[in-house]
Amino acid sequence: SGIFQLRLQEFANERGMLANGRPCEPGCRTFFRICLKHYQATFSEGPCTFGNVSTPVLGTNSFVIRDKNSGSGRNPLQLPFNFTWPGTFSLNIQAWHTPGDDLRPETSPGNSLISQIIIQGSLAVGKNWKSDEQNNTLTRLRYSYRVVCSDNYYGDSCSRLCKKRDDHFGHYECQPDGSLSCLPGWTGKYCDQPICLSGCHEQNGYCSKPDECNCRPGWQGPLCNECIPHNGCRHGTCTIPWQCACDEGWGGLFCDQDLNYCTHHSPCKNGSTCSNSGPRGYTCTCLPGYTGEHCELELSKCASNPCRNGGSCKDHENSYHCLCPPGYYGQHCEHSTLTCADSPCFNGGSCRERNQGASYACECPPNFTGSNCEKKVDRCTSNPCANGGQCLNRGPSRTCRCRPGFTGTHCELHISDCARSPCAHGGTCHDLENGPVCTCPAGFSGRRCEVRITNDACASGPCFNGATCYTGLSPNNFVCNCPYGFVGSRCEFPVGLPPSFPW
């Protein structure tokens, strides 16, 4: 679809003559008839197949024709066509004299032909005017012409339709050849695919307008390259969507089992020692003078047997005092009025005089202690066994009976059960005081992750296009890890054909 445009510039008929040799009376009041048709080697009568047009009276005898863009007598003349421009044409321009109406002379009776010209040739579509001048014995016509495409038509033959748009069906302008030129932010054959935010992950992200980056399920962040942990996860992270990889000190399927209760909750009071013992489990080892599950209870002041030499202890609100037996005195009945002559040393202890007979000192045999060697040695009073070990008196010495997971003279060494890598199939090992605990990866169970779960969600092969299936955090949940070029929770659609976006 296009327009053949003819610009009439000058007509000369200086003698004011008609084609039949007669003069015009009083002068040749001239209008033009134009006939445009398909190319003919010999111009013949018949319909003007490409269009025809007439002008009003443009002047008398000889005159210059100015451009006029509106109203009657528009110049250049417009001959629109709604087909593919063939590149060739035949054009007949006739000059006529009318005695009648200036504006619609072609309807007047008594019109007479002044002259005519016929042009046959080729003409390419373009903005440039082709100029020509035709002379015959009586007249001269100067004119120019061109073919241009109608609005929204492009190409060598005005056959390519392109209408610029900026809506849901496309966002483009038109190039001179009719090809689409996408507006900024859009791409695709019809400029209907938005260009996402730079760096937006091409599988995990998508957009419905330019510079957006919306994440597909399971992904987050500005570029959709960070995974989202499982819905039920409490203290864990992920490396693939819906995973729950436990933070340090947490275990269990949803990382909700506290493996480090001591650090997270500090349950042991009054300076006691806390030892973890399994999920949410712990033991408090109290300092002397305290008791209770959390060492929160203070023992009686007399509980430490502060009175020596058989003195009896009496508790007061914030203190105590010792009632001493005959022959002893002092805050703790530690001083004696006896001498070696009174044979004060028991259990074979030997007596030594001090201070010119005013006092004495007992040297006790092994396993006995006290001012008078009256006490059997308890080598466990100093709580020498660490990590909840049990202290046992063994004659002149003592031994520590350690809890599982500990060793050493004082149970001070931790045995790492995990050093033996007891967890199968990539299970994560946690050293607990009553033995190792394995947190199993998806698809495995058992104390050592040795049992393969076969009835999981991956058994049905739910992932498409060669994707790898991982079972999630419950037997009927799964995650598909898509190969390059595919997306979706089951890798069911290719990246090149994203799901259509609702508008």
């Epitope: 419905s208 919306n214 994440c215 597909r216 399920p217 399971g218 992904w219 987050q220 962040g221 500005p222 960070e226 989202i228 942990p229 819905n231 039920g232 996860c233 409490r234 203290h235 864990g236 992270t237 933070d247 009927n476 949940n477 979706g488 929770s489 089951r490 069911e492 799901p499 259509s500 976006f501 609702p502």
Partner: antibody, heavy 118, light 107 residues
Framework: EVQLVESGGGLVQPGGSLRLSCAAS????????MSWVRQAPGKGLEWVAS????????TIGDSVKGRFTISRDNAKNSLYLQMNSLRAEDTAVYYC???????????WGQGTLVTVSS | DIQMTQSPSSLSASVGDRVTITCRAS??????LAWYQQKPGKSPKLLIF???VLADGVPSRFSGSGSGTDSTLTISSLQPEDFATYYC?????????FGQGTKLEIK
């Protein structure tokens, strides 16, 4: 136990501002994306905004874009919603929820009522 | 935006009944669908995600199914505590959208 506790709601005039807070406990807050969802009286649920876990990338719903902003402070285990240029149609119970705009909302707070009225 | 249409909008049933609520999306949502339960004056509670996966602590009488655009929530034997409003939600496309809700009442 996961707990989300919203605060900051109340009565505000049209054009006014309000800042909602959500205190989280019972999970490692910094590991999870968070969202705000609202519910107008007697109506259904409407997603308002989401924020990613680590880099605090905010995504805001069209109905409140340019007026509301979502933010978080992982050190304080807190989520916030700054609401400016409030309109009558923003009247709703606002819920803090654990989840992103492309995931289920696994845990919800008890909600805080925002009333916009002159 | 994706439109989520629940049916019915309200439903009367008795304890022990089997109840089905459906949710239709305006286009394919690839199983990325959740169901929530909300009791009056309370916040919503996640029941089911990924169309059929039961959330932690949810009784097994609740189940979900569906594919493409249609999803279903089924309660196999209604208990007194199940009378509430139920919402579906899609999370395939931005923005996430909810159904208008189905109110389940005692007959």
């Amino acid at each position: 136990e996961v707990q989300l506790v919203e605060s900051g709601g109340g009565l505000v005039q049209p054009g006014g501002s309000l800042r909602l807070s959500c205190a989280a406990s019972g999970f490692t807050f910094g590991n999870f994306p968070m969202s705000w969802v609202r519910q107008a009286p007697g109506k259904g649920l409407e997603w308002v905004a989401s924020i990613s876990s680590s880099d605090s990338w905010a995504t805001i719903g069209d109905s409140v874009k340019g007026r509301f902003t979502i933010s978080r402070d992982n050190a304080k285990n807190s989520l916030y919603l700054q609401m400016n240029s409030l309109r009558a149609e923003d009247t709703a119970v606002y819920y803090c929820a654990r989840g992103y705009y492309n995931s289920p909302f696994a845990f919800w707070g008890q909600g805080t009522l925002v009333t916009v009225s002159s | 935006d994706i439109q989520m249409t629940q049916s019915p909008s309200s439903l009367s049933a008795s304890v022990g009944d089997r109840v089905t609520i459906t949710c239709r999306a305006s286009q394919e949502i690839y199983r990325n669908l959740a169901w929530y339960q909300q009791k009056p004056g309370k916040s919503p509670k996640l029941l089911i995600f990924d169309t059929s996966v039961l959330a932690d602590g949810v009784p097994s009488r609740f189940s979900g199914s569906g594919s493409g655009t249609d999803s279903t929530l089924t309660i196999s034997s209604l208990q007194p505590e199940d009378f509430a409003t139920y919402y579906c939600q899609q999370y395939t496309y931005y923005p996430p959208t909810f159904g208008q809700g189905t109110k389940l009442e005692i007959k």
